[in-house]
């Protein structure tokens, strides 16, 4: 779980902790500004009680009529109704709609392409390092190391299919056992969920949108982490995945099938291959300890090559090293044998931007990483804007009702399972869970899909990506068929087990609650989203990796106390909220801990100090650019600051938000105003001249 933001008192508590709740008027506050006042202001103060904390959310004390931030926003249609339009208006509106649809599809196309290029960029930057992770011999004996290697490699190459294909090739060539491969597959499952979390970061501009988007993205993370938390120990103890999949593989006489259909790649490849083309075999070769591969570039230069097989005479130290006894001879001094050598003749160069630059992989990767993130961000902003303008009024109502409404009683429970099937089907079509979940993220952000509905869709996506892997396995060559199929089935049954753990019973849907909690923290402290990303996808795996390299004793020596502390904190929180009377007075709340250990506020101050300087410069630059642009387009009205500058200005006014711990996991209520959300329409004026 994410670190706690604010840990309040447990109830009942004789020494009630009281804090001033500033700015709480029964009337609706001005929405054009955040009203974050500090505790020492002379505003009317309402004494509020800090209740026990159940989740990782920070709450605001507010009037009784509350606005649940998790409720989907009502997208008001400010335009003229269809019936009120004249023929010209209707035609214009129709063509506007068509134009918007084309634009939406266009941006969606470039969004998917940028995800593909982002993956390539990550492979260029960290692919070789990822390959070297695999060449670690301890993977065989240490499942925890296997898990973190799976996470790190998938994060570095931004593609679970790349990491699983490396695992498959290693199993096929007996460098890895299926038993050792299972934790890596589990790790790959976790690693692949970083993509949509990165996409969610792009929606940081609007707090309300960001809360939903980030929670919607991290629901995938939490599902994967929790599944691993439960299923990895179970697998280590029972080897159930290995046994089940082995039985399946052995009981069926599989024939080599067709390749999984590349539906989305057919459309995106013509564009992405003009940007960059990679030789992904290099990563696999590094993973398989091929020394020559370490000096090879991942950037593909030659696309058309002619392979000529020839036999050459080579000397060998002894006759035992001969290819075969019949292909062994001597010249009287040395022993000779005949080796098959493949000569690769380059015929035609690839047609992509970087083919003639001969830049190092890191340089190409960095360029592509920046560009793909910019395109990703731009496309996402435009998709959200277009969807925002399209999904208004009646259209939004219909779509939201269709997606989020359950089947009538008594079949309501079936809706989620249908969503799982839809998620699986859609992922199968687009051939990538990253693409599907990343496309889902902005829809959650703008409030078209609820997190409760996004959750089964994401779970379905996890299943969909494994069915693709199963089909790909069936198309493998003879020697790799068994291993690749077994690994694909392990992946499949791991996700099925995870769904059985965290979906059927509503009470067990912990990922939703955890994601909402994280969404709340990240909406208030937006830096925490990046912190979460670094901690969960880099620091924790790297720490475990480092400790594993140091040996079992070190790993256990450090790991056991850490796990013990986490369990202790969780048990203490549970007792504080459920039955605080059994605890000594001191432990009924978290006040015995220093503030920095129970609140993110001190950390926020530190982060703000670090980022303040950069933010100021950024905004100054932003203002200069903006004003120059306004002068050029002769539009004085359009010169408004960006959201980051508004936040900075408001922060400088020195306002703060009084906090209150949540009473339950569910029904978390945070007022939009107190959380500092400003509707997009209020903060931006459209430039008519542009």
């Amino acid at each position: 779980m994410a670190p706690w933001p604010e840990l309040g008192d447990a109830q009942p508590n004789p020494d009630k902790y009281l804090e001033g709740a500033a700015g709480q008027q029964p009337t609706a506050p001005d929405k054009s500004k955040e009203t974050n006042k500090t505790d020492n202001t002379e505003a009317p103060v309402t004494k509020i009680e800090l209740l026990p904390s159940y989740s990782t959310a920070t709450l605001i004390d507010e009037p009784t009529e509350v606005d649940d931030p998790w409720n989907l926003p009502t997208l008001q249609d400010s335009g003229i109704k269809w019936s009120e339009r004249d023929t010209k208006g209707k035609i214009l509106c129709f063509f506007q709609g068509i134009g918007r649809l084309i634009l939406l599809l266009g941006f969606l196309y470039f969004f998917v392409c940028s995800l593909d290029i982002l993956s390539s960029a990550f492979q260029l930057v960290g692919g070789k390092m990822a390959g070297q992770f695999f060449s670690n011999s301890s993977i065989m004996s240490n499942p925890l190391l296997g898990l973190v290697i799976g996470v790190l490699v998938t994060v570095l190459v931004q593609s679970s299919s790349t990491s699983t294909s490396i695992v498959v090739s290693m199993v096929s060539s007996s460098l890895l056992t299926v038993r050792a491969a299972i934790p890596i597959i589990m790790g790959a499952n976790i690693g692949t969920s970083i993509t949509n979390t990165i996409v969610a970061l792009m929606q940081v501009g609007d707090r309300s949108e960001f809360r939903r988007a980030f929670a919607g993205a991290t629901v995938h993370d939490f599902f994967n982490w929790l599944s691993v938390l439960v299923l990895l120990p179970v697998e280590v103890a029972t080897h159930y995945l290995e046994i089940i999949t082995q039985l399946i593989v052995e009981s069926f006489h599989f024939k080599n099938g067709e390749d999984a259909p590349d539906l989305l790649k057919v459309i995106t490849k013509p564009f992405t291959k003009l940007i960059v083309q990679l030789d992904k075999k290099v990563i696999s070769q590094i993973a398989m300890n091929d020394e020559k591969a370490k000096n090879k570039s991942l950037v593909k230069i030659w696309c058309k090559t002619f392979t000529n097989k020839t036999q050459i005479n080579v000397t060998v130290p002894s006759t035992a090293n001969c290819t075969s006894p019949s292909l062994c001879w001597t010249d009287g001094i040395q022993n000779w044998t005949m080796k098959n050598v493949t000569y690769k003749e380059n015929i035609a160069k690839c047609q992509h931007i970087f083919v003639n630059f001969h830049l190092p992989d890191l340089a190409v990767g960095t360029i592509l990483l920046i560009l793909s993130l910019l395109v990703l961000c731009g496309c996402l902003i435009m998709i959200v804007k277009i969807l925002g303008s399209v999904l208004k009024g009646q259209v939004a109502t219909v779509i939201k009702k269709t997606i989020n409404t359950d089947f009538p009683f008594p079949f309501a429970w079936l809706t989620g399972y249908l969503a799982i099937l839809v998620g699986a089907g859609m992922t199968f079509i687009v051939q990538s869970s990253s693409v599907f979940t990343s496309a889902l993220t902005p829809l959650i952000g703008i409030g078209v899909i609820t997190i409760e509905r996004a959750y089964p869709l994401t779970l379905g996506s996890n299943i969909g990506t494994t069915t693709t892997a199963i089909l790909a396995a069936l198309a493998s060559p003879g020697n790799a068929l068994r291993s690749s199929l077994q690994i694909a089935l392990c992946h499949f049954f791991f996700n099925i087990s995870g769904i059985l753990l965290w979906y059927p019973i509503p009470f067990t849907r912990l990922p939703i609650r955890m994601a909402k909690g994280l969404g709340n923290i990240s909406a208030k402290y937006r830096w925490f989203a990046v912190f979460y990303l670094i901690i969960f996808f880099f620091l924790i795996p790297l720490t475990v990796f480092g400790l594993s390299l140091a040996g079992w004793r070190v790993l256990v020596g450090v790991g056991v106390p850490v796990v013990f502390i986490i369990i202790l904190v969780l048990c203490l929180r549970l007792l504080q909220s459920r039955c605080p009377r059994v605890l000594p007075k001191k432990l009924q709340n978290w006040n015995f801990l220093p503030l920095w250990m129970r609140s993110l506020k001190p950390w926020d101050a530190v982060v703000s100090k670090f980022t303040g300087c950069f933010q100021m410069r950024c905004c100054c630059c932003c203002r200069v650019c903006c004003r120059a642009c306004c002068l050029l387009c002769d539009c004085p009205k359009c010169c408004r600051c960006s959201k980051c500058c508004e936040d900075l200005e408001e922060a400088q006014e020195g306002q703060d938000v009084p906090v209150k711990a949540p009473e339950t996991f569910d029904n978390i209520t945070i007022s939009r105003e107190a959380q500092g959300e400003v509707p997009a329409s209020d903060s931006k004026t459209e430039c008519t001249a542009l």
């Epitope: 005479n313 006759t319 075969s324 006894p325 019949s326 292909l327 062994c328 001879w329 001597t330 010249d331 009287g332 001094i333 040395q334 022993n335 000779w336």
Partner: antibody, heavy 120, light 107 residues
């Protein structure tokens, strides 16, 4: 043309040593292996060992190991074969033979042979 | 060491006859076999290497075949100048070994 010229006939007493020389011409001396093959009167051919003049690497027949020594002098393009602790059964014609068919043990150029007689 | 057993040890044939000499290796030598001709009082001369490759200047009536352990040297049409002792040799393993030789005579 390739020519291998060997030293003259030798008569030795048992227990003594003999050093036969073989001077090569007509090809790049250091490139090809030089073999030594002996043939006892009315008998078949017997391979004694080989030397690679380029590096001086040698390989001997286990039967002669410890008794035979092959050396070369690149300045004179000459190969030497010394056989010690001579016995009467060492009486034979000693041939030096060059293998210009690269990477094979088939010898295509032969010296005229040196008759070594071991007699008390 | 690999033993090379040649048969027959001697043979007599008429001019124009097809003559076949066989050589058997004690273990697999692949195709690393050479054939030599040694005329009386002369030095050996390479005829064939790699089982079947004729050395430069060797007449086409000489041919070789076989692989593994069984090898054959064939003189398709015996000529008076072919009177000699023929040796097979393996160069699959050190030490290189020769067959006992086959003496060919004209009837």
């Amino acid at each position: 043309q390739v020519q291998l010229v060997q030293s003259g006939a030798e008569v030795k007493k048992p227990g003594a040593s003999v050093k036969v020389s073989c001077k090569a011409s007509g090809y790049t001396f250091i490139t090809y292996n030089m073999h030594w093959v002996r043939q006892a009167p009315g008998q078949g051919l017997e391979w004694m060992g080989a030397i690679y003049p380029g590096s001086g690497d040698t390989s001997y027949n286990q039967k002669f190991k410890g008794r035979v020594t092959m050396t070369r002098d690149t300045s004179t393009s000459t190969v030497y074969m010394e056989l010690s602790s001579l016995r009467s059964e060492d009486t034979a014609v000693y041939y030096c033979a060059s293998s210009t068919i690269i990477t094979t043990g088939a010898v295509d150029y032969w010296g005229q042979g040196t008759l070594v007689t071991v007699s008390s | 060491d690999i033993q090379m057993t040649q048969s027959p040890s001697s043979l007599s044939a008429s001019v124009g006859d097809r003559v076949t000499i066989t050589c058997k290796a004690s273990q697999d030598v692949g195709t690393a076999v050479a054939w030599y001709q040694q005329k009386p009082g002369k030095v050996p001369k390479l005829l064939i290497y790699w089982t079947s490759t004729r050395h430069t200047g060797v007449p086409s009536r000489f041919s070789g075949s076989g692989s593994g352990t069984d090898f054959t040297l064939t003189i398709s049409s015996l000529q008076p100048e072919d009177v000699a002792t023929y040796y097979c040799q393996q160069y699959s393993r050190i030490p290189l070994t020769f067959g006992g030789g086959t003496k060919v005579e004209i009837k």
